[in-house]
Amino acid sequence: VPRWRQQWSGPGTTKRFPETVLARCVKYTEIHPEMRHVDCQSVWDAFKGAFISKHPCNITEEDYQPLMKLGTQTVPCNKILLWSRIKDLAHQFTQVQRDMFTLEDTLLGYLADDLTWCGEFNTSKINYQSCPDWRKDCSNNPVSVFWKTVSRRFAEAACDVVHVMLNGSRSKIFDKNSTFGSVEVHNLQPEKVQTLEAWVIHGGREDSRDLCQDPTIKELESIISKRNIQFSCKNIYRPDKFLQCVKNPEDSSCTSEI
């Protein structure tokens, strides 16, 4: 008789999850010389230990502490790029501007990017059928708690001028319920962070509105100002040109507004 299994509303663990995490870890340590000595099996064991045999709606930040310790990494604190709802462009940017880092450019962010995982209470099995959905099932699920934990730590580490890339095509350019809005904004340290600079990325080619005047951006400015951090905002009217100018800043067309 097949054992009854909890059916969750979200997709199950990404197939070949253990192999994927291990392979990503090895690849990351090969690309980043400062991580060359890292034992990826230990990293995977700590990752696994955070959610295996635990109820997938009862995961805590504490469960991830062994992994956080092993994943400790020094990123230049004044070169941090946060993003909300515009991951691809943020990653394209840091691939060109190699001295800037998104969370997914760190080991832990790189390991988990675009993956789903969960286990089952009291069994060592990984659940490949379904995992809890943040809205429909529970917020304290393995994936959500992981991103909340690493995002908080990433924001806490930031200093000087912190940049955030926001999607100007969305109805809420700044969304209080996003990871950026609910976690990162509130964990920037005013004693270390001088300014949060928002880059609002325009979607339409003919869109010349000043999206820095958007009510949600004003809301972000208000939250940030109340935390004694300065706020500035820039419109990026042409994201394609923006990336091109990051690649080739000497290009004559890059002096005009982008």
Epitope: P33, H37, V38, D39, K69, L70
Partner: antibody, heavy 119, light 110 residues
Framework: EVQLLESGGGLVPPGGSLRLSCAAS????????MSWVRQAPGKGLEWVST??????????YSADSVKGRFTISRDDSKNTLYLQMNSLRAEDTAVYYC??????????WGQGTTVTVSS | QSVLTQPPSASGTPGQRVTISCSGT????????VHWYQQFPGTAPKLLIY???QRPSGVPDRFSGSKSGTSASLAISGLQSEDEADYYC???????????FGGGTKLTVL
């Protein structure tokens, strides 16, 4: 065959200087991270310095006990690793080994050169 | 300079199995690979085990390494008189940005 040959050791008074060399052969020196490790008489191994390959930034690392006094460097055109030792102290007396990395561990060691700091 | 913790001595009779432990912290053994070196008097250290449990070619399979959490161990089975030597564990330490060695274990074959 991979070979590492240290030279430059000797007797030096406290406060003096020495430059150790390590001539490498049998592998692509340019790509290798390299280290110096020492062993005081009758004692255990103690890491001194490591230098990355130029392609990995050429970054040097040194133990706190030698920081500001010892400098690791490399000359890829000569396949040679160096350790410039200044302000030498009695506690720096040791056999100094040079070692090559195989990605993330030290796999081959030289035979060592003896440094004695004494007046 | 802090070191990884090893017992100063170990002993066994020929044919026996002996184990040498090496303990550290999260910033060295916990996070990074452990390697083992064998050293005979008056000679340079020789790589015995790398990346926790891998044996370089030429090292007999009587030697094995393992790691769990912040500790590692070297096991020698079927002990032979020629195994009498000093054994050192080593791991990179991310806090120090450098290598840490164990204090060394002198193995005596009785």
């Amino acid at each position: 065959e991979v070979q590492l040959l240290e030279s430059g050791g000797g007797l030096v008074p406290p406060g003096g200087s020495l430059r150790l060399s390590c001539a490498a052969s049998g592998f692509t020196f340019t790509n290798a991270w390299m280290s110096w490790v020492r062993q005081a008489p009758g004692k255990g191994l103690e890491w001194v310095s490591t230098i990355r390959s130029k392609t990995d930034g050429g970054t040097p690392y040194s133990a706190d006990s030698v920081k500001g006094r010892f400098t690791i460097s490399r000359d890829d055109s000569k396949n040679t690793l160096y350790l410039q030792m200044n302000s030498l102290r009695a506690e720096d007396t040791a056999v100094y080994y040079c070692a090559k990395y195989d990605y993330n561990y030290m796999d081959v060691w030289g035979q060592g050169t003896t440094v004695t700091v004494s007046s | 300079q802090s070191v990884l913790t090893q017992p100063p001595s170990a002993s066994g009779t020929p044919g026996q199995r002996v184990t040498i432990s090496c303990s550290g912290t999260t910033s060295n053994i916990g996070r990074n690979y452990v390697h083992w070196y064998q050293q005979f008097p008056g000679t340079a250290p020789k790589l015995l085990i790398y990346r926790n449990s891998q044996r370089p070619s030429g090292v007999p399979d009587r030697f094995s390494g393992s790691k769990s959490g912040t500790s590692a161990s070297l096991a020698i089975s079927g002990l032979q008189s020629e195994d009498e030597a000093d054994y050192y564990c080593a791991a990179w330490d991310d806090s120090l940005n450098g290598w840490l060695f164990g204090g060394g274990t002198k193995l005596t074959v009785l």
